[in-house]
């Protein structure tokens, strides 16, 4: 498998078949696909070198691994985005065997003297064919000379199989599987052959192919392949549920941001809650975790502004769920990304220099931001898209909240909406979805560059348009949610989280 | 055809160094583990060391009785393989054998003809 | 170090007859599946040969009279009718674990 390790050293060659038999809209199709595998592996933080070549009769080089910006996802995309069918035109027969031999001459090194790393470095072919080849002669044999160059199935003891993938994808409107079976890696319990069909559902393809390791700990990071569950493209996501004696239980969502701690909002606790008595599942395990502490934000008070008349009072509602034991990270319990991290930094792919406001800048410009929370209905999660309303309609956004009841008496809104909040809801520049009683305390959620970055805690909300947990159908406009900015309590988060290893910029 | 030559040999006064070489051809050399064995007059086999393949950078390995005394090198541009013998001893009389080591089942399948070295004053 | 122990130290045999070499390790020589023994044969005046390698495997062009088996601690070396050409010394060989190591070695002589 492509083991996606941010340590260690890969060098990807996408190879495409660009002959005659293939054909226009086939051709698209598998760029689509390779562009689509580039975007998934840079999720990650890996910078592989890519290797891009297209072939017929010849094969055209397009982009070398040693070329400085190979390692540049974004610039490799744009040169594979500007290849087009008709570069081939001319001769269009299909010599995979000089393609091959063109990627292993990307491989070898001059002089016969391997550069130093050479044996850490793996190696991912990914070819797009229909194993059609008519002429320079059989493709396996320049396979064969390439695990002999990378010493692969020579050393009894360190086979090295795992530094060599051959991944073969059959386009076209006919497939020799005979030919496409043969180049491609033979190894227990992986694929390494896809039809055309089954890149009509590449997270599924992906998921084949990846093996993510080691990098379970990467925040943000989802999976959204047809097999996966609720937890796999959600990993973060926890409930929280408070059982109280003769008061029946109150829930409440949260997010995994490390492996010993849960944020959430703080308004799911009262002090007189037990640790024993508040119960936390990540990961859609029907165990519940054993909670250490509760840590509510030294600001937090409900009842801070009683004399003022607002019954209510929900700034700085955030809180941190201390677990006894560490949580083991897998595909479906991992951690989602925070504000002014190294990770978050890395999962936006900003320069290492990234700042703070510059981080603030790209998650939370002053316009209509596209978000996230999820909530679960019929008991799956599902993610709702919302507008954080951040710049021209912030102050109406906020003004509505002398909607919510007990603040009908409010003056300045401000008294209630204070900056520690994001605003979303109502109808422009979209009908938003509002959040339900038991989202609370689950992440508003920012997704970019295929990563989930939580800049916000649900908090609360102007209308309750959940009856049973049944969002209705017909909701005012002015129906509007409250959520923590992350931004703003971050003192308390990097403190509280100072030995977590999340890297507070 | 495989082939391994070893040279270098002779006689040597205890104290004094030697440099022994093993010539190859037949095979990727680089691609193999390279080992030196010796044995004494009508002794058993000992196996001195080897300069691991490619993959680990010809790294050297010594059985502790020549360790920090014997040098095992190689050069790959010549196939050949040597062994640096300083602060020789009387005990060091043997007939000297390189042999391929083969990766893939972690066995010396090929041996040069020997060579030998007697330590004596 | 792994140290090795062949028995017997000679065997007097009649061509014709089945030779059955011991060799013993002072800790297992397997690693992943497989076992790190092999067997040379070496006659006076001559470099080692090897006859059998990861236990049980037969070196080409070496004859199929001759047979290895075991894994762990415990292998031996059949020869199932012997040939004139088949006295010599014998010797066990671990490659599971550096420092290699060879045992001190079987002659196999005619009675």
């Known amino acids: 498998k492509i083991v996606l390790d941010p340590s260690g050293s890969m060098n990807i060659y996408l190879v495409l078949d660009g002959s005659d038999s293939i054909g226009a809209s086939n051709f698209t199709g598998a760029k689509k696909c390779l562009v689509n595998l580039i975007e998934k592996v840079a999720s990650y933080g890996v910078k592989p070198r890519y290797g891009l070549v297209t072939y017929a009769t010849y094969p055209k080089i397009w982009v070398k691994v040693s070329e400085a910006d190979s390692s540049n996802a974004d610039w490799v995309t744009k040169q594979l985005n500007e290849i087009n069918y008709e570069d081939h035109k001319l001769k269009s027969g299909t010599n995979t065997k000089k393609a091959l031999q063109a990627v292993y001459s990307m491989m070898s090194w001059p002089d016969d003297v391997p550069p130093e790393g050479w044996n850490r470095t793996r190696h991912v072919i990914i070819l797009m064919t229909d194993g059609l080849h008519n002429m320079g002669g059989d493709p396996i044999t320049v396979i064969d000379e390439i695990r002999d160059l990378l010493y692969i199935g020579k050393d009894r003891k360190n086979p090295r199989e795992d530094y060599l993938d051959v991944y073969v994808f059959g386009v076209g409107p006919l497939v020799n599987q005979v030919n496409i079976n043969a180049l491609a890696s033979k190894k227990d319990n992986e694929q390494h052959v896809f039809k055309v069909k089954d890149m009509e559902n590449l997270e599924d393809v992906f998921y084949q192919m990846i093996d993510e390791s080691q990098s379970l700990s990467l925040c943000g990071m989802v999976w959204e392949h047809r097999k996966g569950t609720d937890y796999h493209k959600q990993p973060w996501q926890a409930k929280i549920s408070v059982i109280r004696p003769s008061k029946g239980h109150e829930s409440c969502m949260g997010a995994v941001v490390s492996e010993y701690f849960v944020l959430t909002a703080a308004h799911c606790f009262t002090v007189d809650d037990k640790e024993h008595s508040i119960k936390v599942s990540v990961g859609g395990e029907k165990r519940d975790l054993e909670i250490e502490v509760v840590l509510f934000h030294p600001n937090y008070n409900i009842n801070g502004k009683k004399e003022a008349g607002i019954p209510e009072f929900y700034d700085y509602d955030v809180a941190l769920i201390k677990l006894k034991n560490k949580l083991k990270y897998g595909q479906t319990i991992r951690p989602i990304c925070l504000p002014c991290t190294e990770g978050t930094t890395r999962a936006l792919r900003l320069p290492p220099t990234t700042t703070c406001q510059q981080q603030k800048e790209e998650l939370l410009p002053a316009q209509d931001i596209k978000a996230l929370f999820v909530s679960e209905e019929e008991k799956k999660l599902t993610r709702k898209e919302v507008y954080i309303k951040n710049g021209d309609k912030k102050g109406s956004c906020e003004r509505d909240a002398q909607y919510a009841p007990g603040y009908d008496k409010v003056k300045d809104i401000s008294e209630v909406v204070t900056p520690r909040f994001l605003c979303t809801g109502g109808v422009s520049p979209y009908a938003d979805p509002n959040t339900c009683r038991g989202d609370s305390g689950g992440p508003l959620i920012v997704h970019k560059r295929s990563r989930f970055i939580q800049v916000g805690v649900i908090s609360w909300g102007v209308v309750d348009v959940c009856k049973n947990q049944k969002r209705q159908k017909q909701v005012p406009a002015h129906a509007r949610d409250f959520h923590i900015n992350l931004f703003q309590v971050l003192p308390w988060l990097k403190e509280k989280l100072q030995d977590e290893d999340l890297g507070f910029l | 055809e495989v082939q391994l030559v070893e040279s270098g040999g002779g006689l040597v006064q205890p104290g004094g160094s030697l440099r022994l070489s093993c010539a190859t051809s037949g095979f990727t050399f680089r691609d193999y583990y390279m080992s030196w064995v010796r044995q004494a007059p009508g002794k058993g086999l000992e196996w001195l060391g080897f300069s691991r393949h490619r993959v680990y950078g010809y790294t050297p390995e010594y059985a502790a009785s020549v360790k920090g005394r014997f040098t095992i090198s190689r050069d790959n541009s010549k196939n050949t393989l040597y062994l640096q013998m300083n602060s020789l001893k009387t005990e060091d009389t043997a007939v000297y054998y390189c042999?391929?080591?083969?990766?893939?089942?972690?066995?010396?399948?090929?041996w040069g003809q020997g060579t030998l070295v007697t330590v004596s004053s | 170090e792994i140290v090795l122990t062949q028995s017997p130290a000679t065997l007097s045999l009649s061509p014709g007859e089945r030779a059955t070499l011991g060799c013993k390790a002072s800790q297992s020589v397997d690693y992943d599946g497989d076992s790190y023994m092999n067997w040379y044969q070496q006659k006076p005046g001559q470099a080692p040969r090897l006859l059998i390698y990861a236990a049980s495997n037969l070196e080409s062009g070496i004859p199929a009279r001759f047979s290895g088996s075991g894994s762990g601690t415990d292998f031996t070396l059949t020869i199932s009718s012997l040939e004139p050409e088949d006295f010599a010394v014998y010797y066990c060989q671990q490659s599971n674990a550096d420092p290699y190591t060879f045992g001190q070695g079987t002659k196999l002589e005619i009675k």
């Open positions: 042999a391929r080591d083969n990766p893939g089942y972690y066995a010396m399948d090929y």
